[in-house]
C-alpha cells in the first residue's frame, strides 16, 4: 500500500534571468528512495541516484545545478522555462511517487510575488 505523499512548492513564479529552486519532499512512507528524477514535460533534466549521485542532462548542464537536498536549482531563467516540472521519486517497495510544480517565468517588472514561493 502506498502511504507516501509528496509536498511541493506548488505554483511558483520567478524573474527572467534569475534563478529558482524546485523542491519536493516525500513523507509518510518508510520506503527506500532509490532515485529521484526531475523532468520538464517529457524532457529529463536531472537524476539523483541513491548510489551514483547526481547526473545532469548534457543539454541542461549550464543552467541546472543539483540541490539543495533532492531539489533542483534552475539558473538564467528564460520565458521558455515556463511550464510544468515533475519530481519523480522511485521507491522500494512502494513504487513511484510524482510531484508537480508549475513555474512561470516573468519579465522583471511583472514578477513581484515570485519570491514568496521560493524555498530559501
Amino acid at each position: 500500500m502506498m502511504t507516501g505523499t509528496i509536498e511541493t512548492t506548488g505554483n511558483i513564479s520567478a524573474e527572467k534571468g534569475g534563478s529558482i529552486i524546485l523542491q519536493c519532499h516525500l513523507s509518510s512512507t518508510t520506503a527506500q528512495v532509490t532515485q529521484v528524477n526531475w523532468e520538464q514535460q517529457d524532457q529529463l533534466l536531472a537524476i539523483c541516484n541513491a548510489d551514483l549521485g547526481w547526473h545532469i542532462s548534457p543539454s541542461f548542464k549550464d543552467r541546472v545545478a543539483p540541490g539543495p537536498g533532492l531539489g533542483l536549482t534552475l539558473q538564467s531563467l528564460t520565458v521558455n522555462d515556463t511550464g510544468e516540472y515533475f519530481c519523480i521519486y522511485h521507491t522500494y517497495p512502494d513504487g513511484t511517487y510524482t510531484g508537480r510544480i508549475f513555474l512561470e517565468v516573468l519579465e522583471s517588472s511583472v514578477a513581484e510575488h515570485g519570491a514568496r514561493f521560493q524555498i530559501p
Epitope: T3, S28, Q32, C48, A50, G69, L70
Partner: antibody, heavy 116, light 108 residues
Framework: QVQLKQSGPGLVQPSQSLSITCTVS????????VHWVRQSPGKGLEWLGV???????DYNAAFISRLSISKDNSKSQVFFKMNSLQTNDTAIYYC??????????WGAGTTVTVSS | QIVLTQSPAIMSASLGERVTMTCTAS???????LHWYQQKPGSSPKLWIY???NLASGVPARFSGSGSGTSYSLTISSMEAEDAATYYC?????????FGAGTKLELK
C-alpha cells in the same frame, strides 16, 4: 505548541503486554505520522514502527509479530501495544512526530521495566 | 538493514575547542535522509541537524553537519559547556530506520 505526552505502566510482568498512550497537542493526527522508538542500555535507540496520518502502519520486521499501533484522531491519541514482553524489552519507549522523514518532536518517554 | 557506526564512542573537549564526530553507514544513504539528534541525561532526544546540514530551530550556529554517501560528520566550531551531551545519527533512507550508538561528548 507541539507536544506529545505519554502515559503507561512502569512495570510489566514477563510474558505480559505493554500498552502506552501518546496524546498529542498542537497538531492533528490526520496530518502527521507518529513513530515509536525505544532506548535501552544494551541496544541503544531502536525504531519500532509508525502510524501514518491515514491510519495505516509500518512496523520494524523484528517486532511485527507482537506489535500493534492504532489511534483515535478525534481524541488526538496514539496507542502502542506490544505483546509477550521479556526482560530484554526493558527500555524507555518514546513516541515522536515525523516531518519530512525526520522526527522533529519527541515525547518525554515512558520508562518500562519488565520484571517479575 | 543499514548499520550506522559512530566514532568516537566517547570524547572530551575543552571550552573553545573544535569538535568533530563521524557517522559511517554500512551502505549509501541519501543525504536528505541522514539526521542528528542531541540527548542529555534524563531527557528525550532532540532534533539537532536534519538532512545532513540543516540546523534545527534553536541550534547554535557553531554546529554544522556535512557528508554524503556513507560518510557523515557533525562539527562544533567552538565547544561550549552546554554542548556536553550524546549525539546520535539516524538514517531514514531505508526501513528499518536505524540509529547510531551515539557519541558521548564530555567537557574536559
Amino acid at each position: 505548541q507541539v507536544q506529545l505526552k505519554q502515559s503507561g505502566p512502569g512495570l510489566v510482568q514477563p510474558s505480559q503486554s505493554l500498552s502506552i498512550t501518546c496524546t498529542v497537542s498542537g497538531f492533528s493526527l490526520t496530518s502527521y505520522g507518529v513513530h515509536w522508538v525505544r532506548q535501552s542500555p544494551g541496544k541503544g535507540l531502536e525504531w519500532l514502527g509508525v502510524i501514518w496520518s491515514g491510519g495505516s502502519t509500518d512496523y520494524n520486521a523484528a517486532f511485527i509479530s507482537r506489535l500493534s499501533i492504532s489511534k483515535d484522531n478525534s481524541k488526538s491519541q496514539v496507542f502502542f501495544k506490544m505483546n509477550s514482553l521479556q526482560t530484554n524489552d526493558t527500555a524507555i519507549y518514546y513516541c515522536a512526530r515525523e516531518v519530512r522523514r525526520y522526527f522533529d518532536v519527541w515525547g518525554a518517554g515512558t520508562t518500562v521495566t519488565v520484571s517479575s | 538493514q543499514i548499520v550506522l557506526t559512530q566514532s568516537p564512542a566517547i570524547m572530551s573537549a575543552s571550552l573553545g575547542e573544535r569538535v568533530t564526530m563521524t557517522c559511517t553507514a554500512s551502505s549509501s544513504v541519501i543525504s536528505s535522509y541522514l539526521h542528528w539528534y542531541q540527548q542529555k541525561p534524563g531527557s528525550s532526544p532532540k532534533l539537532w541537524i536534519y538532512s545532513t546540514s540543516n540546523l534545527a530551530s534553536g541550534v547554535p550556529a557553531r554546529f554544522s553537519g556535512s557528508g554524503s554517501g556513507t560518510s557523515y560528520s557533525l562539527t562544533i566550531s567552538s565547544m561550549e559547556a552546554e554542548d556536553a551531551a550524546t549525539y546520535y545519527c539516524h538514517q531514514y533512507h531505508r526501513s528499518p530506520l536505524t540509529f547510531g550508538a551515539g557519541t558521548k561528548l564530555e567537557l574536559k
